[in-house]
Amino acid sequence: IWELKKDVYVVELDWYPDAPGEMVVLTCDTPEEDGITWTLDQSSEVLGSGKTLTIQVKEFGDAGQYTCHKGGEVLSHSLLLLHKKEDGIWSTDILKDQKEPKNKTFLRCEAKNYSGRFTCWWLTTISTDLTFSVKSSRGSSDPQGVTCGAATLSAERVRGDNKEYEYSVECQEDSACPAAEESLPIEVMVDAVHKLKYENYTSSFFIRDIIKPDPPKNLQLKPLKNSRQVEVSWEYPDTWSTPHSYFSLTFCVQVQGKSKREKKDRVFTDKTSATVICRKNASISVRAQDRYYSSSWSEWASVPCS
Amino acid sequence: RNLPVATPDPGMFPCLHHSQNLLRAVSNMLQKARQTLEFYPCTSEEIDHEDITKDKTSTVEACLPLELTKNESCLNSRETSFITNGSCLASRKTSFMMALCLSSIYEDLKMYQVEFKTMNAKLLMDPKRQIFLDQNMLAVIDELMQALNFNSETVPQKSSLEEPDFYKTKIKLCILLHAFRIRAVTIDRVMSYLNAS
């Protein structure tokens, strides 16, 4: 048993039929010595008396909010949560496996630049009675500071008959140098509590591997005289690391017809302009990627050809 | 990256072209190692990230762009010095870049070159003949060193009398390639920055 936060404890249980469970001793936080009674979840049934209560925690029926009272007055509470381990594997009932980039991916993280700021998000089909807390560090044996905000509900989506909820959190490495070569990964740990169930999820990554630039900005077309060609120009996104001559991007320019089946013309360039043929009803899109370290491409920025 | 790229003319700055070749060569070699050694721990998640140049060179600090010198987190061990004597910067007046930066890059290349050559000698003794270092990558390291044109003592190639442990050698190859790729990215960024200066 360990303390998650004040008056909230997690009991780790091997989950199999007729498992013996864990013996837990609860102590009432009071100077009083006698006349103390215990209840679970404010029911009228008295579980025991005395300053300590010994319970065998085997299942969810044994978890909950234990309260010690004296003469009708509440003295203290202890909330017991369960963390289930089945066949040596901790349960992952609360979050949805996003299966990207591989199976058992519950947390996904992205950074728009090398500033040490990143966002992580996760999905669940649970709508209420749910709390998350997020911690992060650089490395685990001698951890360096990363500060994370509160997790917030960032999106709701309908998937078939079911609703899916996306939560996200922003974190910032306390002393990050954009030019640094990372040798220790960032560790992100999410504690999830749904009613009486506790689970934890972790992700480990280098900022360089989760880089996804914002789309190029100010995408513009300039028709070339007496030609079907146009000059496409754009700029580095505002959120990208500077100086741009050090943190350089490479770009992919795509000409796409109205129909998805039409052949796409693609050009790759390190410059912030390109000359392409603009077909009627087509659109021109540009996306960006770190020039030297191939992490994710940005989303497309697009303009119509007309 | 295996994509058609319209690369700009390296122009006045020959090292930029060489550093781009270096990054391409080490990335290809790392990809080849990952594929060939698929049953070895060779991915970024599986390996220990070691830097053989740690405490010996200070490339990141020495080659820091001017704009980042205001960032306290980047200034842990920054040393300053002035104008370079390397040929890459011949006829270029620049207050940003010091000899220390390019000589630090040169020292990195020299250290990796020695390690790779020693490792290749061991891999050539492997009866499985599973993987060898790409000669193109070794040649590109050499070309960039020549372009940097620094004179420094030659480091003798390490020779080992004991029977090599080929499993350990292959894991060490993965570790080296990962670290060298990261350093090659830094070198490329630096050269790009210098080229624009």
Partner: antibody, heavy 117, light 107 residues
């Protein structure tokens, strides 16, 4: 002793509104949700929504948004549900129940609402 | 929203019989399922929560099991006072939903 005491039966005209009360005793009102459930003969149990006075959160079944409104008075530990624009479809027994970790563990005795002209 | 399909709708049994009611969720609800008993003219009473945990004071002839989408409620030895309608309910994700109910009648 945990108890949820609901207000008495109501006979209402179509188009009118009704406010049902649910007085909670024997536990800390703020620690639990008060859920509201509708039961019509032959229709089983239908969850309308819930209200947590402790967090100020409401949780509605989409179907009853605009029909039901939840409020509470912490001084008397009483939860209320107002049903507006009543029609014959709203004729039912309405239950309040407390919920936290273990389903709806205590229920009120039910309030019968009949809508008839 | 999650649909709870409960079967059968009716059960006619003799005292002492074993009764099994099943509930199938339209998507995984982990073990967040409760079972209620509603006797004629009364409000529902909680019997089982977290799929298999008996609520305080509930006789041990009432048992529940299941995980994910398939849940079972059993009365091992039916007694005359068990005449009631039984409902399953998921409280994994709102809107909370109930099964259609199973009316248990004693011969």
């Amino acid at each position: 002793q945990v108890q949820l005491q609901q207000s008495g039966a109501e006979l209402m005209k179509p188009g009118a509104s009704v406010k049902i009360s649910c007085k909670a005793t024997g536990y800390t009102f703020n620690d639990y949700w008060i859920e509201w459930v509708k039961q019509r003969p032959g229709h089983g149990l239908e969850w309308i929504g819930g209200f947590s006075h402790g967090s100020g959160s409401t949780n509605y079944n989409e179907k009853f948004k605009g029909k039901a409104t939840f409020t509470a008075d912490s001084s008397s530990n009483t939860a209320y549900m107002q049903l507006s624009s009543l029609t014959s479809e709203d004729s039912a027994v309405y239950y309040c129940a407390r919920r936290r970790f273990r389903g709806m563990d205590y229920w009120g005795q039910g309030t019968s609402v009949t809508v008839s002209s | 929203s999650i649909v709870m399909t409960q079967t059968p709708k009716f059960l006619l049994v003799s005292a002492g019989d074993r009764v099994t009611i099943t509930c199938k969720a339209s998507q995984s609800v982990s073990n967040d399922v409760a079972w209620y008993q509603q006797k004629p003219g009364q409000s529902p009473k909680l019997l089982i929560y977290y799929a298999s945990n008996r609520y305080t004071g509930v006789p041990d002839r009432f048992t529940g099991s299941g995980y994910g989408t398939d849940f079972t409620f059993t009365i091992t030895t039916v007694q005359a006072e068990d005449l009631a309608v039984y409902f399953c309910q998921q409280d994994y994700s709102s809107p909370w939903s109930f099964g259609g109910g199973t009316k248990l009648e004693i011969k």
